[in-house]
Amino acid sequence: IPTEIPTSALVKETLALLSTHRTLLIANETLRIPVPVHKNHQLCTEEIFQGIGTLESQTVQGGTVERLFKNLSLIKKYIDGQKKKCGEERRRANQFLDYLQEFLGVMNTEWIIES
Amino acid sequence: IPTEIPTSALVKETLALLSTHRTLLIANETLRIPVPVHKNHQLCTEEIFQGIGTLESQTVQGGTVERLFKNLSLIKKYIDGQKKKCGEERRRANQFLDYLQEFLGVMNTEWIIES
């Protein structure tokens, strides 16, 4: 799969492949994988991809199921790249405070916060 | 500050304190703090709180600015708790796939994805 495929298209295709291969992926009934308790997904990317690794190691490869796992590894690569961009640019306190304000604002409106 | 204050109220109060103390917080003009380039904030919580630590170490403490940093440390505590919940529960492949589908669906609709 060329890495040039836009990430948004990659995600869409992966969702479709996930539905297609569901039966094969749940075949191992003894398998236990960590599942986050909350819906703040971005906080859990590490665990999600560890789970994908566990699933891949237990799934019979071949055909488009291989494409599914290849896609998922490209999505991981994209997310790792985004994580790198968290700390690459060192800016003044002024810009940091604007970003912090945005972060807290997003927490306030979009995060799923339990009381 | 009692930890019992709901996190949502804590975030609101912190936003207000941030505005109040802005001038004091930007006083050190030589300070450089990592600022993420993108808006996928949850991926960057580690760097954001490292930045807050840098800012705190360079800010003259006293009065309500102390309350600001106390609040921020409680928010960090909340997020750390959320991160712990990413891997505590081990479920069947079926549940994991439901969560993965939800994660990709959120990525598809809510994440800020550059082409």
């Epitope: 810009q95 945005e102 604002g105 | 030589t30 600022v35």
Partner: antibody, heavy 119, light 107 residues
Framework: QVQLVQSGAEVKKPGASVKVSCKAS????????INWVRQAPGQGLEWIGY????????RYNQKFKGRATLTVDKSTSTAYMELSSLRSEDTAVYYC????????????WGQGTLVTVSS | DIQMTQSPSSLSASVGDRVTITCKAS??????LSWIQQKPGKAPKTLIH???RLIDGVPSRFSGSGSGQDFTLTISSLQPEDFATYYC?????????FGQGTKVEIK
């Protein structure tokens, strides 16, 4: 493709206000800050401020604080710059420009809007 | 505010010449500087960001260098379409500030 299209030229009397629009297309509007820059005839460029469409937060050059107001309409992916108490020295071409990332370089510019202040 | 001093304010050059424009910041701006080209009656266009990173689609004859306070824009071999005014912009701190511009004219 990514585009910023600005409203047409305006002629205003001293003391009046002007509101310039900047319609974004080809990208997710809330992902990038919008900056406003002006250029008086034969002069250089001057930064007015920026607005973050993600949270409506704006920051101004002190020189324009109190006179310039930056707003956005997310439903139409449009940014606005309103300048009040106009004087003849506000005659300029006003540009909107998109930040590539947070507090980053301006990767896309609008075509400019000429505002003439004359009695 | 951070002052950006650009020099020269204008220069005359011929096609094929190597042209250098400098920009000096009144304080350390790290590498948060971009170079902008503007042709008469047109909107500005960013050529280089973060002091030395060429923007996609910009010809490789343009290059930038420097960090801290001193920065340079170089056009290795001037082309007819390069006759324009060039500005430096610091986006290190608010308010963002521009140099006063360098007009590159045909000799």
């Amino acid at each position: 493709q990514v585009q910023l299209v600005q409203s047409g030229a305006e002629v205003k009397k001293p003391g009046a206000s002007v509101k310039v629009s900047c319609k974004a297309s080809g990208y997710t509007f809330t992902n990038h800050h919008i900056n406003w820059v002006r250029q008086a005839p034969g002069q250089g460029l001057e930064w007015i401020g920026y607005i973050n469409p993600y949270n409506d937060y704006s920051r101004y050059n002190q020189k324009f604080k109190g006179r310039a107001t930056l707003t956005v309409d997310k439903s139409t992916s449009t940014a606005y710059m309103e300048l009040s108490s106009l004087r003849s020295e506000d005659t300029a071409v006003y540009y909107c420009a998109r930040d590539y990332g947070n507090f980053w370089y301006f990767d896309v510019w609008g075509q400019g809007t000429l505002v003439t202040v004359s009695s | 505010d951070i002052q950006m001093t650009q020099s020269p304010s204008s220069l005359s050059a011929s096609v094929g010449d190597r042209v250098t424009i400098t920009c000096k910041a009144s304080q350390d701006i790290n590498s948060y500087l971009s170079w902008i080209q503007q042709k008469p009656g047109k909107a500005p266009k960013t050529l280089i960001h973060r002091a030395d990173r060429l923007i996609d689609g910009v010809p490789s004859r343009f290059s930038g260098s420097g960090s801290g306070q001193d920065f340079t824009l170089t056009i290795s071999s001037l082309q007819p379409e390069d006759f324009a005014t060039y500005y430096c912009l610091q986006y290190d701190d608010f308010p963002y500030t521009f140099g006063q511009g360098t007009k590159v004219e045909i000799k």
